[in-house]
Amino acid sequence: DIIMRPSCAPGWFYHKSNCYGYFRKLRNWSDAELECQSYGNGAHLASILSLKEASTIAEYISGYQRSQPIWIGLHDPQKRQQWQWIDGAMYLYRSWSGKSMGGNKHCAEMSSNNNFLTWSSNECNKRQHFLCKYRP
């Protein structure tokens, strides 16, 4: 049997059953999530659920830039350090940079400091690039 790999929307990249879109536009976290959702197909700010997924994403983004942090779909909606993925995925894989999680920083970004392999918390109203994800 020939198994066809699902195709992603133009400009999105495919990895292990998911499509990813890297937006080099500045949005706060909630506006970024709304823009992801506007693409349908269950798109959200990206969940990153394994080192392999993190490495693939980091390698892709490094082909575009190496200095700007990027919003992902991890947030702390109750502001109690109870982090969760906006797409409902289980919060098992973690890749925090080790920076302080205090203050009013309840949204997560991929940090450029470690080639996008680790995350930092940041204030959700900051305008940054963002990464969307959906399953085709």
Epitope: A9, G11, G21, Y22, F23, R24, K25, L26, Q68
Partner: antibody
């Protein structure tokens, strides 16, 4: 007031090199990249490359790789663009334009342009 | 990728004109689109940045938009004036490269 002041017109022979300068004032030089854009007579805008005065990173248009070098001198807030092995089709107005580092939102101030004529 | 613009457009004073800018591949919404005006003999100036934002000093007759379905950006100029005549260029990004459209000559009849 932000200003980008470019050097004067140049006439060069084929095979020669030209170095155009762009002196910036009115803002923090290292906070903005400098792009170089050229426009041949009667033609559109062609992006040549970009340099960051902050860390000296450069990106050049593939078409010009190997012939162009962009540099900056932070002590004088001046950017330079050198183009080597000139050909007649390099005849153009050369513009410098600033772009906020990491912004991806375009070129908000431009120099007035430097006409480079390549003729034997 | 490439950004394709119509070679020329013309319209009468007071009317509205729209100039399109179509991306040949990828997703135009991934990057900001800018628009530049160039009057004869002058350097370009930015009239729209970040898809639809007017820099200070640009009249509100100028507006920008993105149409994801056609993978294109548009510049709309309403209440056309003679001073709007000139060349208009869209600009966006592809990885580390900055990309310009081929330019559109606007003639105000």
């Amino acid at each position: 007031e932000v200003q980008l002041v470019q050097s004067g017109a140049e006439v060069k022979k084929p095979g020669a090199s030209v170095k155009v300068s762009c002196k910036a004032s009115g803002y923090t030089f290292t906070s903005y990249g400098i792009n170089w854009v050229r426009q041949a007579p009667g033609q559109g805008l062609e992006w040549m490359g970009w340099i960051s005065p902050y860390n000296y990173n450069t990106n050049y248009a593939q078409k010009l790789q190997g012939r162009v070098t962009m540099t900056t001198d932070t002590s004088t807030s001046t950017a330079y663009m050198e183009l080597r092995s000139l050909r007649s089709d390099d005849t153009a107005v050369y513009y410098c334009a600033r772009e906020e580092t990491g912004s991806y939102h375009g070129f908000d101030y431009w120099g007035r342009g430097t006409l480079v004529t390549v003729s034997s | 990728f490439m950004l394709t613009q119509p070679h020329s457009v013309s319209e009468s004073p007071g009317k509205t004109v729209t100039i399109s800018c179509t991306a040949s591949s990828g997703n135009i919404a991934f990057n900001y689109v800018q628009w530049y005006q160039q009057r004869p003999g002058s350097a370009p100036t930015i009239v729209i940045q970040e898809d639809n934002q007017r820099p200070s000093g640009v009249p509100d007759r100028f507006s920008g938009s993105i149409d994801r379905s056609s993978n294109s950006a548009s510049l709309t100029i309403s209440g056309l004036k003679a001073e709007d005549e000139g060349d208009y260029y869209c600009q966006s990004y592809d990885k580390y490269y900055r990309i310009f459209g081929g330019g559109t000559k606007l003639t105000v009849l």
